[in-house]
């Protein structure tokens, strides 16, 4: 018995062109959660039930609202690990599916709407008890960075968590460095000793004296990242030219891209260009199939006809969405506007409106500007049911009655000094900097590091 642990480090746009738009917006704030599904990695044809090793769902992450005009950043993540307990032996080779789900929190009054943002999958070799293995997977334009490990729960030990060792209450009769092991208390087990020098972070062993490498590492002692440059040994000092004495294996040697993907070297590693219907770091993920168990809430999975729709979920009553992930009730059509709460009274629906709104569907925005004055030339702005003043330059506060200090926010960068001025503010820049906010360094040759047009 033991636990598979998954730590998500980041989920955001991958490198390269075609960065995805943020999945959340000001109108539809959302939060992420993750689902992991584990299967023993026996063979591609193994008719395993979906998630035969187990599955886990993360907590919901923090609510995120897109800043208008900003590129999609790495999105805020749920706290904690995803833990998948396993009862039997750890198989050593396993398949994983990690899904990133979006929970929309806007006007989804009939309960939140869920949609699948990205799904990554892979097959890995992993010994229980080893260190955290790091991985990066891409799904379309998204990139997921994560670490995982398998650890045994006492009294289980070993790379498969199949041996039971218990600490002895009596002083050990075993020699130094040996541990007593159940079932026979007088049987002593030597801790597994890998090949001398085998990297404790990137290598592991299942037999004494061996050194097997985790994903992304190579070399006899698993100390060489797969992404190192093609030069294994530099030329001697007598050589005037730079280059390689013996060309080492390039990252694309042997084509790591599966399913007909084409490999191209990148400064740090390699990149696979995948054919239609495949994705993942090595094009190892085909369009998800019914074997992956993609249908929630008892949906019936039917294989699709083409690679772009590898499955179709037939949802039971009360659920819809491509994965039957959305609960459907009579409030699901969102009859209430402006954030009103939909209530199903049985015979009909009713809307409970937020402050500042009225009407059967909360459609009327109560004019909070009526009879309200904004001082010092400010103008009243309606919206969200709240009265807000847009103040003239130099004034602030709810009713524009406060004189604003434009320097309060310390707007001048790199030690520039701020001076309040009738038209706003002026920055006096420190030597070596220029710009309205002293944001650009001036290079010695006189050119400033202005952003490219």
């Amino acid at each position: 018995a033991g636990v598979f642990e998954l730590q998500i480090h980041s989920f955001g746009p991958g490198p390269g062109p075609g960065a995805p738009r943020s999945p959340c917006s000001a109108r539809l704030p959302c939060r992420l959660f993750f689902r992991v599904c584990l299967k023993p990695g026996l063979s591609e044809e193994a008719a395993e039930s979906p998630c035969a090793l187990g599955a886990a769902l993360s907590a919901r992450g923090p609510v995120y609202t897109e800043q208008p005009g900003a590129p999609a950043p790495d999105l805020p993540l749920p706290d904690g690990l995803l833990q998948v307990p396993f009862r039997d032996a750890w198989p050593g080779t396993f398949s994983f599916i990690i899904e990133t789900w979006r929970e929309e929190l806007g006007d989804q009054i009939g309960g939140p709407a869920w949609s699948l943002l990205a799904r990554v999958a892979g097959r890995r070799r992993l010994a229980a008890g080893g260190p955290w293995a790091r991985d990066i997977q891409r799904a379309g334009a998204w990139e997921l960075r994560f670490s995982y490990r398998a650890r045994c729960e006492p009294p289980a030990v070993g790379t498969a968590c199949t041996r039971l060792c218990r600490p002895r209450s009596a002083p050990s009769r075993c020699g130094p460095g040996l541990r007593p092991c159940a079932p026979l208390e007088d049987e002593c087990e030597a801790p597994l000793v890998c090949r001398a020098g085998c990297s404790p972070e990137h290598g592991f062993c299942e037999q004494p004296g061996e050194c097997r490498c985790l994903e992304g590492w190579t070399g006899p002692l698993c100390t060489v990242p797969v992404s190192t440059s093609s030069c294994l040994s530099p030329r001697g000092p007598s050589s005037a030219t730079t280059g390689c004495l013996v060309p080492g294996p390039g990252p694309c040697d042997g084509n790591p891209c599966a399913n007909g993907g084409s490999c191209s070297e990148t400064p740090r590693s390699f990149e696979c260009t995948c054919p239609r219907g495949f994705y993942g770091l090595r094009c190892e993920v085909s369009g998800v199939t019914c074997a992956d168990g993609p249908c929630f809430n008892g949906g019936l999975c039917v294989g699709g006809a083409d690679p772009d729709s590898a499955y179709i979920c037939h949802c039971p009553p009360g659920f819809q969405g491509s994965n039957c992930e959305k609960r459907v009730d009579r409030c699901s059509l969102q009859p209430c506007r402006n954030g009103g709460l939909c209530l199903d009274l049985g015979h009909a629906l009713r809307c409970r409106c937020r402050a500042g709104f009225a009407g059967p569907r909360c459609e009327h925005d109560l004019d909070d500007c009526a009879g309200r004055a904004c001082a010092n030339g400010g103008t009243c702005v309606e919206g969200g049911g709240a009265h807000r003043c847009s103040c003239a330059l130099g004034f602030g506060g709810r009713d524009c009655r406060e004189r604003a200090d434009p320097c309060a926010a310390r707007p001048c960068a790199h030690g520039g000094r701020c001076y309040a001025h009738f038209s706003g503010l002026v920055c006096a820049c420190a030597p070596g900097y220029m710009g309205a906010r002293c944001e650009f360094p001036v290079h010695p040759d006189g050119a400033s590091a202005l952003p490219a047009a």
């Epitope: 006007d107 009553p317 009579r330 059509l333 969102q334 009859p335 015979h347 009909a348 009713r350 809307c351």
Partner: antibody, heavy 120, light 107 residues
């Protein structure tokens, strides 16, 4: 006077697409959902789906998932039913029917129907 | 999906007769149902909503009753213009479902 006026009959070949329109007048378009109902020759009524014209949110009968799409154009008070990859069994009369969005009423007003014939 | 079982599927009656059509839902629908009338070659027309309420302009000889899963449409005195097909529909839960219809013919 409340009226739902649908587009005219269509004769299409298998594999083609069709877009049926339903123009609403005489009421506030966004205050009522629009239902779409199929009636095959000599058969009863079958509910296809519903759309909220205000938000564009749709719910489909699972039997009509995939090739069928509901949409609206609020500027012209028009609801649409699009059917792609037409099959012979799509031959039917298609009706739009409005329903109060707070479900205080049932499908009270119906369009006159649009006959779609799929034949090679 | 909620099944709506309508009976009879057809009936013959004379002008002035009292006619009753029933509809049984496969689960309770709390009155979220209506009755529709459809004449040959025409669109359906709403008669009753919420099980018992008459739509605007519908003659008072039509009435609806029932609760839970069982509902009845009654025409107290059949008129010549009432010969048509009648359908029940539930809107308690998506997908909405219709009964199979009842054809009311002249005897």
């Amino acid at each position: 006077e409340v009226q739902l006026v649908q587009s005219g009959s269509e004769l299409k070949k298998p594999g083609a697409s069709v877009k049926v329109s339903c123009k609403a007048s005489g009421y506030t378009f966004t205050d009522y959902y629009m239902n779409w109902v199929k009636q095959a020759p000599g058969q009863g009524l079958e509910w296809m789906g519903i759309i909220n014209p205000y938000s564009g949110v749709t719910i489909y009968n699972h039997k009509f998932k995939g090739r069928f799409a509901l949409s609206v154009d609020k500027s012209s008070n028009t609801a649409y039913l699009q059917i792609s990859s037409l099959k012979a069994e799509d031959t039917a009369v298609y009706y739009c029917a409005r329903q109060d969005s707070l479900l205080d009423y049932a499908m009270d007003y119906w369009g006159q129907g649009t006959t779609v014939t799929v034949s090679s | 999906d909620i099944q709506m079982t309508q009976s009879p599927s057809s009936l013959s009656a004379s002008v002035g007769d009292r006619v009753t059509i029933t509809c049984h839902a496969s689960q309770g629908i709390s009155g979220n149902m209506g009755w529709l009338q459809q004449k040959p070659g025409k669109a359906p027309k709403g008669l009753i909503y919420h099980g018992a309420n008459l739509e605007d302009g519908v003659p008072s000889r039509f009435s609806g009753s029932g609760s839970g899963a069982d509902y009845t449409l009654t025409i107290s005195s059949l008129q010549p213009e009432d010969f048509a097909d009648y359908y029940c529909v539930q809107y308690a839960q998506f997908p909405y479902t219709f009964g199979g219809g009842t054809k009311v013919e002249i005897k």
